[in-house]
């Protein structure tokens, strides 16, 4: 019995519903009374959802899963996972038994977009060319961990003196803080790009430093 699942991971946004596709080819005369369907976590073998003896046996996974009962007879054994959480990420095995059995695993990749970065400077007033400042780029509640890039106004990458930290909250979402230390020129723009590698989503923030001497009251920051 051949069981088919997508080769590529299923990508789901945190808080949305995901469908883990799984299908099989029922033989002529197949009835649901013959079907034994098990969804389980591939690594831990924890039961997620099952169908046996012609009946949906229900969710064993925080009541957030459902089958597509009207489609089972056609060989659609897909699983709906509701309100996806970071902790759901991983591999799910679909095990189908009729007379023979087949099993296959589908990967769930969870993602959450990063917020538009906020930019802060320290110090943020009485600045002059030649001063060393730290520019902090902060972006929140994304998943998985971000890639952070800095560049100047001409698009030249700034790689030296960058320190990036990422901290997960209780939901597993990451807050990213990246600090760039630079020596000020007469003027300049410094941009931070926070990229979600799964969603290929870029969040941009920049700050432009102008004037001589330069002062940065809070309302001069460009967000």
């Amino acid at each position: 019995l051949e069981v088919q699942v997508p080769e590529d991971p299923v990508v789901a946004l945190v808080g949305t519903d995901a469908t883990l596709c799984c299908s099989f080819s029922p033989e002529p005369g197949f009835s649901l009374a013959q079907l034994n369907l098990i969804w389980q976590l591939t690594d831990t073998k924890q039961l997620v959802h099952s169908f046996a003896e012609g009946q949906d046996q229900g969710s064993a996974y925080a009541n957030r899963t459902a089958l597509f009962p009207d489609l089972l007879a056609q060989g659609n054994a897909s699983l709906r996972l509701q309100r996806v959480r970071v902790a759901d990420e991983g591999s799910f095995t679909c095990f189908v038994s009729i007379r023979d059995f087949g099993s296959a695993a589908v990967s769930l990749q969870v993602a959450a977009p990063y917020s538009k970065p906020s930019m802060t400077l320290e110090p943020n007033k009485d600045l002059r060319p030649g001063d060393t400042v730290t520019i902090t780029c902060s972006s929140y509640r994304g998943y998985p961990e971000a890639e952070v890039f800095w560049q100047d106004g001409q698009g030249v990458p700034l790689t030296g003196n960058v320190t990036t930290s990422q901290m997960a909250n209780e939901q597993g979402l990451f807050d990213v803080h990246s600090v760039l230390r630079v020596v000020l020129g007469a003027n300049g723009t410094y941009s931070c790009l926070v990229r979600n590698p799964v969603l290929q989503q870029d969040a941009h923030g920049s700050v432009t430093i102008t004037g001589q001497p330069m002062t940065f009251p809070h309302h001069h920051h460009h967000h």
Epitope: Q4, I38, S91, D100, A104, A105
Partner: antibody
């Protein structure tokens, strides 16, 4: 400690019958799929049959379908293989093998095997 | 059914050498549902690797598995005297479950 002990092998004539048993201990028997795997003299491994933990689902290799019946008695922690209409090509060492879980049919524990010889 | 072809049939090596065993499937094995076993003369097989790359309990780290889809490899990084045996791959994605024909690793 997981232990699997096969018994019931022996010499039988073509067309005859044998019943193999496998006594299991050291694990929760009813939670695991169980299997029979055989090995003809000097040959490789061949899966014969498998059964789910509850006994509700059974699976067979094409070469034994309709002739062999796998069953289990979870109250006795025992696996069985009823072999009918035996043929010379069924001659092999028969191993009882425990599946890693209820639905992962690879084998983390094996018995030492019992020899079945089909010959006139 | 899924046919597994192992190569080479025999591998003649010395202790301390690296052994590379191949297992090729006739069709894609979903999600690396492939296991490797070692069998010594007069003994039952014993599980080495499952999930194509996960070592079974108590298996030394000189044994490693890799591969996906249709091509899988068992590597023994440095052969110990007790490693010489016959090695079998097995797919557990579909019934009927199938084994490869085996690779004998013998002392050169």
């Amino acid at each position: 400690e997981v232990q699997l002990l096969e018994s019931g092998g022996g010499l039988v004539q073509p067309g005859g019958s044998l019943r193999l048993s496998c006594a299991a201990s050291g694990f929760t028997f009813s939670s695991y799929a169980m299997n029979w795997v055989r090995q003809a003299p000097g040959k490789g491994l061949e899966w014969v049959s498998g059964i789910s933990g509850s006994g509700g689902s059974t699976y067979y290799a094409d070469s034994v379908q309709g002739r062999f019946t796998i069953s289990r008695d979870n109250s006795k922690n025992t696996l069985y293989l009823q072999m009918n209409s035996l043929r010379a090509e069924d001659t092999a060492v028969y191993y009882c093998a425990k599946a890693r879980s209820g639905y992962d049919y690879f084998f983390d524990y094996w018995g030492q095997g019992t020899l079945v010889t089909v010959s006139s | 059914e899924i046919v597994l072809t192992q190569s080479p049939g025999t591998l003649s090596l010395s202790p301390g050498e690296r052994a590379t065993l191949s297992c090729r499937a006739s069709q894609r094995i979903s999600s690396s549902f492939l296991a490797w076993y070692q069998q010594k003369p007069g003994q039952a097989p014993s599980l080495l690797i499952y999930g194509a790359s996960s070592r079974a309990t108590g298996i030394p780290d000189r044994f490693s598995g890799s591969g996906s889809g249709t091509d899988f490899t068992l590597t023994i990084s440095s052969l110990e005297p007790e490693d010489f045996a016959v090695f079998y791959c097995q797919q557990y994605s579909n019934s009927p479950l199938t084994f490869g024909g085996g690779t004998k690793v013998e002392i050169k």
